[in-house]
């Protein structure tokens, strides 16, 4: 007897973290003996999507022509062969931003700030918010992500670096979200521009410390796994 | 049109167990998850069970948990509602109601067969 | 278990708006819980309204809405006609089994 079917890949165009009202279509790419593509989110109560596939057979296309809280969320897709259903694709986790209005990033003490020395990014959202997200332009992973704890909402997050290296110069945005959902954030932040001065090259930040910059897919946020207390809020990187 | 016809109901004694079928017509059966949902005498409407389209995911209200199982036949466009270590508070009218090709086409509960009414008494 | 709460009565005129609500126990009702909502005519004929992903079922009249209003699931009759008085429900998804409210009984005073 044969082996389970192959598990077919999912993947969302032109990203998997879209604006509110913008279109996103998500891909299911299983073999040529496809004949249905089932699209499934995570905790709902029926199948998401089911279509045929496109020609020739080993693809099928679910289009969100205008993106809305609904359609945030992990999704897993299969396919059904003459054989039977396919194991499931790794999960896609698709974000909305937009669902609230933005917060604002600042620098302490100064955006500009001498290599060897620290500094802190303030996110802040007008209301009390208990996930906060952090987010470098053109990092591999760019983000930090700090939650409260025991779901206690705050209005601001601190983001301290230290000591400041030539890796933490760059453009960085942040998000606030409520924890309900992980798939729904703000409107981001306006940018603010880190500016790192001085020749004083220090080693490497280490995750704990500062903006991730493991490798990884640009489009793909960070989900929370590991955790550390830090000023009432629990910090979380990958 | 779409027709939903419940029977199998009847008297039965506690801790006994019963099947309940319902026929569907008017519709493309295998595409569609089904619901069984129940009234009881004078209460309201509480939904007992649903399966997916081919099957492959079952949910069940708690309080049947472990002694009804909802399964389907889609080449007899049939559904079925086992009951087994039936209780007096299982006695309602037993509905089946049809549910969604997807969620992102149609309505779940779109629409309902007439009932049958199942009553658990010594 | 949660449990699902809304108005036991409602009385309203003809073209009149009237909004049904139906919170949950568990806290806010969200998109997540996919709202929905089921008439009861006399005779124990339930139809299907609105639900899934603010989807109506094919022929019921647009005058029928859906909606979330602050921490709440609504039904909106934007107005009303005699022919719609009767019971509804309306039910929410946790996780993995749905919960039904105990029915509006909404009067259409003619």
């Known amino acids: 007897q044969a082996g389970p079917l192959p598990k077919p890949t999912l993947w969302a165009e032109p990203g998997s973290v879209i604006s509110w009202g913008n279109s996103v279509t998500i891909w299911c790419q299983g073999t040529l003996e496809a004949r249905e593509y089932r699209l499934d989110k995570e905790e709902s109560p029926a199948p998401w999507d089911r279509q045929n596939p496109l020609e020739p057979k080993n693809k099928a296309r679910f289009s969100i022509p205008s993106m809305t809280e609904d359609y945030a969320g992990r999704y897993r897709c299969y396919y059904r062969s003459p054989v039977g259903w396919s194991q499931p694709s790794d999960p896609l986790e698709l974000v909305m931003t937009g669902a609230y209005s933005k917060p604002t990033l600042s620098a302490l003490p100064s955006p500009l700030v001498t290599s060897g020395k620290s500094v802190t990014l303030l996110c802040q959202s007008r209301s009390p918010m208990d996930t906060f997200l952090l987010i470098k332009e053109r990092a591999a992973h760019p983000l930090l992500h700090l939650r409260s704890e025991h779901g206690a909402q705050q209005h601001q997050a601190e983001f301290p670096m230290s000591p400041v290296t030539s890796v933490h110069g760059g453009t960085y945005r942040c998000f606030s979200s409520h924890g309900f959902s992980h798939y729904l954030l703000s409107h981001p932040s306006d940018p603010l521009e880190l500016i790192v001065s001085g020749s004083l090259e220090g080693p490497r930040p280490s995750p704990t410390r500062s903006v991730s910059t493991a490798a990884g897919p640009e489009d793909q946020p960070l989900m929370p796994t590991g955790s550390v207390p830090h000023s009432g809020l629990r910090r979380h990187w990958e | 049109q779409v027709q939903l016809v419940e029977s199998g109901g009847g008297v039965v004694q506690p801790g006994r167990s019963l099947r309940l079928s319902c026929a569907a017509s008017g519709f493309t059966f295998s595409t569609y998850g089904i619901h069984w949902v129940r009234q009881a005498p004078g209460k309201g409407l509480e939904w007992v069970a649903v399966?997916?389209?081919?099957?492959?995911?079952?949910y069940y209200a708690d309080s049947v948990k472990g002694r009804f199982t909802i399964s389907r036949d889609n080449s007899k466009n049939t559904l079925y509602l086992q009951m087994n270590s039936l209780r007096a508070e299982d006695t309602a009218v037993y509905y089946c109601a049809r549910d969604v090709i997807s969620m992102v086409r149609g309505v779940p509960f779109d629409y309902w067969g007439q009932g049958t009414l199942v009553t658990v008494s010594s | 278990d949660a449990v699902v709460t809304q108005e036991s009565a409602l009385t309203t005129s003809p073209g009149e708006t009237v909004t049904l609500t139906c919170r949950s126990s568990?806290?806010?009702?969200?998109?997540?819980?996919?709202a929905n909502w089921v008439q009861e005519k006399p005779d124990h004929l339930f139809t299907g309204l609105i639900g899934g992903i603010n989807n109506r079922v094919p022929g019921v009249p647009a005058r029928f809405s859906g909606s979330l209003i602050g921490d709440k699931a609504a039904l909106t009759i934007t107005g009303a006609q005699t022919e719609d008085e009767a019971i509804y429900f309306c039910?929410?998804?946790?996780?993995?089994?749905?919960?039904f409210g105990g029915g509006t009984k909404v009067t259409v005073l003619g």
């Open positions: 039910a929410l998804w946790y996780s993995n089994h749905w919960v």
């Open positions: 399966i997916w389209f081919d099957g492959s995911n079952k």
């Open positions: 568990t806290g806010a009702v969200t998109t997540s819980n996919y």
